[in-house]
Interface confidence: low
């Protein structure tokens, strides 16, 4: 008799990450009979939705359906038709929508309502769209990277399956940078978490974890830039803002109405004698760094120690995975190598920011000018945030690993979110049955 290939017994899940600057759709796949094993879920597709984040559709909600079409159709192609009806779809919106909700709960609800109606039209098992909290974003990012690094597995391996694995069960901390918020999450060493808002307790695979997390709203790279501009224009003598965070020779006109559109700049808002101002780049890393530091209030701390703005932060502990914009920006700047010291990163940033804009445009001809113009600011901001905000030092810098993907899956909150919502991370260690791992050879 002829051997017939048995149909693959797999499951799929879809998570849409509705971020402040864009939306991405992730498709995950796993063997159906191994749902409770650690490390079996992997990403098979990422589809970046063309256009801005969903919060920008507040005045044009009728366009949301078309906006989501391409990536949802891509999911239809990737996932076998027979699996469509049982494939869960989740949409989580992050800080861009948190900010919109701060401005108007009604407008945020309207956007989510249209998103839900659009996603319900597809043949998948739509499970809802919601704005996740900053704590969830931090927690799920932490779960994702540690799941992918095999940190929840009780079996210690004699070989390393991922580049960052140190072959111990010590979890990695998670550093996530988005456009509108940034999250820091890790297991402190025998330290009381002095602020209950920042304390998470998990029981995963039979082990208890006491995790610290905080999400700094308005301190994602895009909102931090708006904050810096709003702060600096207060002291400008006219409608010219000479800005050290942009390359020499760079010029851009900014509408004051756009500057004050976000809740993140409210604390700097003032009546200006002009409707527009012009940014003129002067490209000076040191001055840019100084200007950024003024966004962090370190003068007040009601705890034993703080990050900034009075937010408790325990002493840093262990290795950290830095992902999302931490990775994208540092990758562009060619600074993700484990061998590059903090001093070297600073030196490279000084040189990069000082390069004339015309020269930069020529060197990176394929990169959109909007993004290209902001790498000096973003790189400097990342250094300021990690060093002054989170208190990394030149020595502890080597414990930061800039991570894009782990074993083919993007580092970020989406995988952890799906694992949680599909109950694929058991509280207790699953009992392994004979031959249950025979396919791991």
């Amino acid at each position: 008799t002829q051997n017939k290939a048995l149909p693959e017994n797999v499951k799929y899940g879809i998570v849409l990450d509705a971020g402040s600057s864009h939306t991405s759709l992730y498709i995950y796949k796993w063997p159906a009979e191994k749902e409770n094993d650690t490390g079996v879920v992997h990403q098979v597709e990422e589809c970046r939705v063309k256009g801005p984040g969903i919060s920008k559709f507040v005045q044009k909600v009728n366009e949301i359906g078309i906006y989501l079409t391409d990536c949802m159709e891509r999911a239809r192609e990737v996932i076998p038709r027979s699996q469509h009806q049982e494939t869960p779809v989740y949409l989580g919106a992050t800080a861009g929508m948190r900010l919109l909700r701060m401005e108007s709960e009604e407008l945020a609800d309207r956007v989510l309502d249209v998103v839900e109606r659009s996603l319900s039209n597809y043949p998948f098992d739509f499970q809802g769209a919601r704005i996740i909290t900053g704590q969830e974003e931090g927690a799920y990012g932490w779960i994702t990277i540690n799941y992918l690094l095999g940190k929840f597995s009780q079996k210690t391996r004699w070989f390393s399956i991922v580049p960052y694995e140190t072959n111990n069960q010590e979890t990695f901390g998670a550093l996530d940078l988005g456009g509108a918020s940034t999250q820091v999450t890790f297991v402190p060493q025998n330290q009381t978490i002095e602020s209950p808002d920042n304390a998470l307790q998990f029981r995963l695979y039979g082990k208890d974890y006491n995790v610290y997390t905080h999400s700094f709203l308005c301190y994602g790279k895009d909102q931090a830039l708006w904050q810096k501009l709003a702060k600096d224009i207060q002291v400008a003598s006219n409608e010219i803002l000479r800005d050290p965070c942009f390359h020499p020779g760079y010029k851009k006109v900014v509408n004051v109405s756009d500057l004050y559109k976000t809740p993140c700049t409210k604390r700097f808002e003032m009546t200006l004698p002009f409707q527009q101002f012009e940014i003129q780049g002067i490209g000076n890393y040191q001055q840019c760094h100084q200007s950024i530091l003024e966004l962090f209030n370190t003068s007040y701390c009601p705890y034993s120690q703080c990050a900034f703005n009075g937010i408790f932060l325990p002493p840093l502990q262990g290795d950290f995975g830095a992902f999302s914009a931490f990775y994208f920006v540092m990758k562009f700047l060619n600074l993700t190598s484990e061998k590059v010291s903090q001093e070297k990163v600073t030196e490279m940033m000084k040189k990069f920011c000082a390069q004339p804009w015309e020269e930069i445009k020529t060197s990176y001809a394929g990169v959109k000018e909007k993004y290209l113009s902001e790498y000096c600011f973003s790189g400097t901001y990342i250094l300021s945030l990690l060093l002054q905000g989170y208190h990394f030092t030149a020595d502890s810098w080597e414990h930061i690993h800039f991570i894009g993907k782990i074993q083919g899956s993007d580092a970020g909150w989406t995988l952890g979110y799906m694992l949680n919502l599909t109950n694929m991370i058991p509280a207790e260690q699953p009992l392994s049955t004979p031959l249950s791992h025979s396919t791991y050879v």
Epitope: A139, S195, P196, D197, A199, L200, N420
Partner: antibody, heavy 120, light 110 residues
Framework: EQQLVESGGGLVQPGGSLRLSCAVS????????ISWVRQAPGKGLEYIAI???????YYASWAKGRVTISKDSSKNTVYLQMGSLRAEDMAVYFC??????????????WGPGTLVTVSS | DYQMTQSPSTLSASVGDRVTITCQAS??????LAWYQQKPGKRPKLLIY???SLASGVPSRFSGSGSGTEFTLTISSLQPDDFATYYC????????????FGGGTKVEIK
Amino acid sequence: EQQLVESGGGLVQPGGSLRLSCAVSGFSLSSYAISWVRQAPGKGLEYIAIINSYGTTYYASWAKGRVTISKDSSKNTVYLQMGSLRAEDMAVYFCARGDSYGSGVGLGLWGPGTLVTVSS
Amino acid sequence: DYQMTQSPSTLSASVGDRVTITCQASQNIYSNLAWYQQKPGKRPKLLIYRASSLASGVPSRFSGSGSGTEFTLTISSLQPDDFATYYCQQGFSSNNVDNTFGGGTKVEIK
């Protein structure tokens, strides 16, 4: 409108058991912690248990083993299962919403309460 | 355990008086303290969270202060609607919720 409504209270005999429900609307249980608090007639507020947004549970020491807090996010309901009831358990039982993980920013939203009477 | 001790247990005052209620924690709870108002037969109402932040919709005559182990609730000018029982609550530890609330302070008409 965001609200919590308790139900399941009533008369129960000593030694009996009871399951109280707290139905929430206008917000998601995956974003907030829910606490149960009770108040005996003429007495102060007494914490019973809390379930955070991740499903982690904590109990007052007197409640451990006698009380179970749980939630069904699909039904938007938190439960308080109570056993071995005694006369001193007679009280109004409130459920209240904290932040994601507990009550670090206070319990900002309370249900109207449900009365549990323990008597033979 | 975090023992919360409130004083006084009863306080007689007149409309327009400045009223102060104190709450002491047996251990350092940093600024993780909330104050509630409760009227007979009603649910408690959050007044102050994180020791000094005014909850939404609460009149500005209510204020909170303190951190660590000593906390104060002040009503700057007592109004007829303010006669009620007030409770403090530690929001620091979820693991130790036995004595999370203070015993209460009843503010009655003098």
